[in-house]
C-alpha cells in the first residue's frame, strides 16, 4: 500500500509520541495466541518468568494477560507543532508486577518485574492488520514488532508494508 518509505514515515515519529496521562483508558484481560492458534504461556522458572509459544492440550487452561491501553498523541507531520492523531499503546502483564519488555539489544521479549511508571520498553503500539488480529510494535524501536521465532517470542524487524501482514507478528486476543 505505501511501501518501505511509508513504513519508515509512520514509525519515525513514534520516538516523539507522548502518552497522555498516566492511567490507562481501559484494561482488558485476555488470552494471547498466535495467528496459528498456538498459546502464549508464562512459566515461573528459577525465580524468573519464561515465555513459551505452544500447543495446549484439549482442556488445558490458557494463561491470561492484562492489556492496559494508553492514548498517545502523535505530533503533526505537516506543522510540527500540532497533533496529527492518536495512537493506542499497550502494556502486557501476565501476572502482578511483571510486564513484557522489549530488549532491543538482544532482539528478545522478556518479563521484567518493575514499578510504575513503566519504562518505554514496556509500551507497544497496537496495530490491527486484520479484523481479528493485532500486532505489537516497540515504542522504543519503531518498525520492530513482537513476533514468534523458534517457539519463543522475539523482536522482528518489519521493513515493508507487505511484511506487516506476515503471520509471525500477528496475534489473537480472546476472553476465553
Amino acid at each position: 500500500a505505501f511501501g518501505i518509505s511509508g513504513v519508515q514515515k509512520y514509525t519515525r515519529a513514534l520516538h516523539d509520541s507522548s502518552i497522555t496521562g498516566i492511567s490507562p483508558i481501559t484494561e482488558y484481560l485476555a488470552s494471547l495466541s498466535t495467528y496459528n492458534d498456538q498459546s502464549i504461556t508464562f512459566a515461573l522458572e528459577d525465580e524468573s518468568y519464561e515465555i513459551y509459544v505452544e500447543d495446549l492440550k484439549k482442556d488445558e487452561k490458557k494463561d491470561k494477560v492484562l492489556l492496559s491501553y494508553y492514548e498517545s498523541q502523535h505530533p503533526s507531520n505537516e506543522s510540527g507543532d500540532g497533533v496529527d492523531g492518536k495512537m493506542l499503546m499497550v502494556t502486557l502483564s501476565p501476572t502482578k508486577d511483571f510486564w513484557l519488555h522489549a530488549n532491543n539489544k538482544e532482539h528478545s521479549v522478556e518479563l521484567h518485574k518493575c514499578e510504575k511508571p513503566l519504562p518505554d520498553q514496556a509500551f507497544f503500539v497496537l496495530h490491527n492488520m486484520h479484523s481479528n488480529c493485532v500486532s505489537f510494535e516497540c515504542k522504543t524501536d519503531p518498525g520492530v514488532f513482537i513476533g514468534v521465532k523458534d517457539n519463543h517470542l522475539a523482536l522482528i524487524k518489519v521493513d515493508s508494508s507487505e511484511n506487516l501482514c506476515t503471520e509471525n507478528i500477528l496475534f489473537k486476543l480472546s476472553e476465553t
Partner: antibody
C-alpha cells in the same frame, strides 16, 4: 482540520453499478483504517465495508459481500466503494468515516463525511 | 454476529432532566463500545468511545458506563441542543453492529 467529502451518489436502476469516492484531507490518510457506513431513509446505521490502513485487508457484512468492493489510493488520500448488482434495499445515505486511532480499529468513528445519497429505483 | 438492543426506542424529556439510554449486547465483548448523536439531516457525531471515554469537545454532561453486555449513556442535565437520536455501536467483533437508535424528544 480533518475533512471527508463523499461524491458519486445518485439514482441508479436495480442491477446497476455506482462508484462512490471519498476525498480525505487534514490527516495522514495512510495511517488509518477507513470505513463506509450507510443509513437508509428514516432508519438506523449499518456498517458497509472497512479497509485496513495498509490496504491489505477488506471486510464486509453478508448483506453486501460479493457485490461491494472497498479500496483506497493513499497517493490521492482517497477512499472508494464500488457497488455492483445494486438492489432497492441499498438505497441509503453513504458515509465515509475514519477510525479514531492510527493503525487500528478501536474507539469508534470520530470523523464522518456529509454523506452521499444512493437511490436504487426503476 | 453481536446484536445490539437499544432501549428505549424513544423517550420524551424536559430540559434539565437526567436521561439514561441502555444498550444490551447479545454476547459479551471488550469495551470497544461507542455512542453517537445524530440530528436530522446531519452526520452522526461521536460522543463516547471505549464505553466511557468522552470524545474531545463533547460536554461533560454526557457520560458512558458499562462492560460485558450492558452499556449505558447518561445525559446528566438535558439541554435544548441534546434533542436528537442516539446510537450505540460495538467495534469489538466483525461485523460491526449498531443499536437501533433512541430518539430523545421534547416533552
Amino acid at each position: 482540520e480533518v475533512q471527508l467529502v463523499e461524491s458519486g451518489g445518485g439514482l441508479v436502476q436495480p442491477g446497476g453499478s455506482l462508484r462512490l469516492s471519498c476525498a480525505a484531507s487534514g490527516f495522514t490518510f495512510n495511517n488509518y483504517w477507513m470505513t463506509w457506513i450507510r443509513q437508509a431513509p428514516g432508519k438506523g446505521l449499518e456498517w458497509v465495508a472497512s479497509i485496513t490502513y495498509t490496504g491489505g485487508g477488506t471486510y464486509y457484512p453478508d448483506s453486501v459481500k460479493g457485490r461491494f468492493t472497498i479500496s483506497r489510493d493513499d497517493a490521492k488520500s482517497s477512499l472508494y466503494l464500488q457497488m455492483n448488482s445494486l438492489r432497492a434495499e441499498d438505497t441509503a445515505v453513504y458515509y465515509c468515516t475514519r477510525a479514531n486511532y492510527y493503525y487500528n480499529t478501536y474507539g469508534g468513528f470520530p470523523y464522518w463525511g456529509q454523506g452521499t445519497l444512493v437511490t436504487v429505483s426503476s | 454476529d453481536i446484536q445490539m438492543t437499544q432501549s428505549p426506542s424513544s423517550l420524551s424529556a424536559s430540559v434539565g432532566d437526567r436521561v439514561t439510554i441502555t444498550c444490551l449486547a447479545s454476547e459479551g465483548f471488550s469495551n470497544d463500545l461507542a455512542w453517537y448523536q445524530q440530528k436530522p439531516g446531519k452526520s452522526p457525531k461521536l460522543l463516547i468511545y471505549a464505553a466511557s471515554r468522552l470524545q474531545d469537545g463533547v460536554p461533560s454532561r454526557f457520560s458512558g458506563s458499562g462492560s460485558g453486555t450492558d452499556f449505558t449513556l447518561t445525559i446528566s442535565s438535558l439541554q435544548p441542543e441534546d434533542f436528537a437520536t442516539y446510537f450505540c455501536q460495538q467495534g469489538s467483533k466483525y461485523p460491526l453492529t449498531f443499536g437501533g437508535g433512541t430518539k430523545v424528544e421534547i416533552k
